[in-house]
């Protein structure tokens, strides 16, 4: 269950992959596209509104939680827009919705090396977005073996790695990045 | 069925005023930055303001800054240009226009027109 | 700003293929729109960021964009393609439109 039905904090950030390609949206009212693109030089890139929220119950991973806490994100690309997970069709989805979220909308926040993170399905936990011919897709890791895997892997780019440490509290968070006093916007909520 | 219906046009004199009215169907009006672009008589496109879908920020061609206002009231469905001033090269064909994909969080202007009404003449003459 | 240059007129036979080039400064660095306007009517999109297609847009109009250039192709020109086309692009929250090109189909 989620902690509170207000987030603990907010950012937007644009999302790339790991290999600096970035994840954009175009919407319409009954319809969508999610590109994974290069953008050009005059490309303003699009943002998504993070919403940070604590879970009591622990994803299929241990190592990001603190206390026994997850911290699970939403992904919203404009207002009353989140990003969700279709797993019967492996698919990652817009969904205009109102709130209180469905599940398929909570993605469990995973810190990983060279400032990069990772989102786990919260309804199929082993389960991440990931990057699958140049669309997003949901993508099961085995753990033995993927840890790493370059394609689960997203740089939230206009978030302060600071600010990530703060939030996701990996113990082995190293700042790799001189350029990290990325100004950031985020919004705290006083339950 | 997106549909922009123009109105409001007609004959002015110079440093006359006028207002045009955008009737918007079809859509989720308040999701969607709007523009208004104008086309003198035998003449090209020109852009002339923009504002994003909550109306909080609004965007000039600098032909006609300080003279017109954009607003939009999204309760009606209705996107507005503010005329004052005019002038006889304001003379054209206004369109309202939208973009064709809803507005992201950061905004700016960055999409294409996509849909565009049927336009309004503006003839400003003495 | 920038200045958006087209040519004002070009010519084409029935089923050739019609370019229509939009020239300026660091063109390639944005995204080009393409606009359609028939004597009488409204315009019309019928290419964005450079090369995409809208939903009824025929396959025979295509774009690129590179270096100084946008350019618009029409393959296989037809009858109802003779009309006014326009680019455009975004510079700083301002929109830029060429002067346009009349299509005559001979």
């Known amino acids: 269950s989620i902690t509170g039905i207000s987030p603990i904090t907010e950012s937007l950030a644009s999302l790339s992959t790991y290999n600096d390609q970035s994840i954009t949206f175009a919407l319409e009212d009954e319809s969508y596209e999610i590109y994974v693109e290069d953008l050009k030089k005059d490309k303003k890139k699009d943002k998504v509104l993070l919403s940070y929220y604590e879970s009591q119950h622990p994803s299929s991973e241990s190592g990001d939680g603190v206390d026994g806490k997850m911290l699970m994100v939403t992904l919203s690309p404009t207002k009353d827009f989140w990003l969700q997970a279709n797993n019967k069709e492996h698919s990652v989805e817009l969904h205009k919705c109102e709130k209180p979220l469905p599940d398929q909308a909570f993605f469990v926040l995973h810190n990983r090396s060279f400032n990069c993170v990772s989102f786990e399905c919260k309804t199929d936990p082993g389960v991440f977005i990931g990057v699958k011919d140049n669309h997003l897709a949901l993508i099961k890791v085995d753990y033995s073996e993927n840890l790493g895997s370059e394609n689960i892997l997203f740089k939230l780019s206009e978030i302060n790695p600071a600010f990530l440490y703060k939030v996701v509290g990996a113990a082995d968070y190293k700042d790799d990045d001189d350029k990290a006093a990325h100004h950031h916007h985020h919004h705290h909520h006083h339950h | 069925e997106v549909q922009l219906l123009e109105s409001g046009g007609g004959l002015v004199q110079p440093g006359g005023s006028l207002r045009l009215s955008c009737a918007a169907s079809?859509?989720?009006?308040?999701?969607?930055?709007m523009s208004w672009v104008r086309q003198a008589p035998g003449k090209g496109l020109e852009w002339v303001s923009a504002i994003s879908g909550s109306g909080g920020s609004t965007y000039y061609a600098d032909s006609v800054k300080g003279r017109f206002t954009i607003s939009r009231d999204n309760s009606k469905n209705t996107l507005y240009l503010q005329m004052n001033s005019l002038r006889a090269e304001d003379t054209a064909v206004y369109y309202c226009?939208?973009?064709?994909?809803?507005?992201?969080w950061g905004g700016g202007l960055r999409y294409p027109f996509g849909y565009w009404g049927q336009g309004t003449m503006v003839t400003v003459s003495s | 700003l920038p200045v958006l240059t087209q040519p004002p007129s070009v010519s084409v036979s029935p089923g050739q293929k019609a370019s229509i080039t939009c020239s300026g400064e660091r063109m390639g660095d944005k995204y080009a729109a393409w606009y359609q306007q028939k004597p009488g009517q409204s315009p019309i999109l019928v290419i964005y960021?450079?090369?995409k297609r809208p939903s009824g847009i025929p396959e025979r109009f295509s774009g690129s964009n590179s270096g100084n250039t946008a350019t618009l192709t029409i393959s296989g020109t037809q009858d109802m393609d003779e009309a006014d086309y326009y680019c455009?692009?975004?510079?700083?929250?301002?929109?830029?439109f060429g002067g346009g090109t009349k299509v005559t189909v001979l």
């Open positions: 226009a939208r973009d064709l994909w809803i507005q992201l």
């Open positions: 079809g859509f989720t009006f308040s999701s969607y930055a």
């Open positions: 455009q692009v975004w510079d700083s929250s301002t929109g830029v």
């Open positions: 960021q450079d090369t």
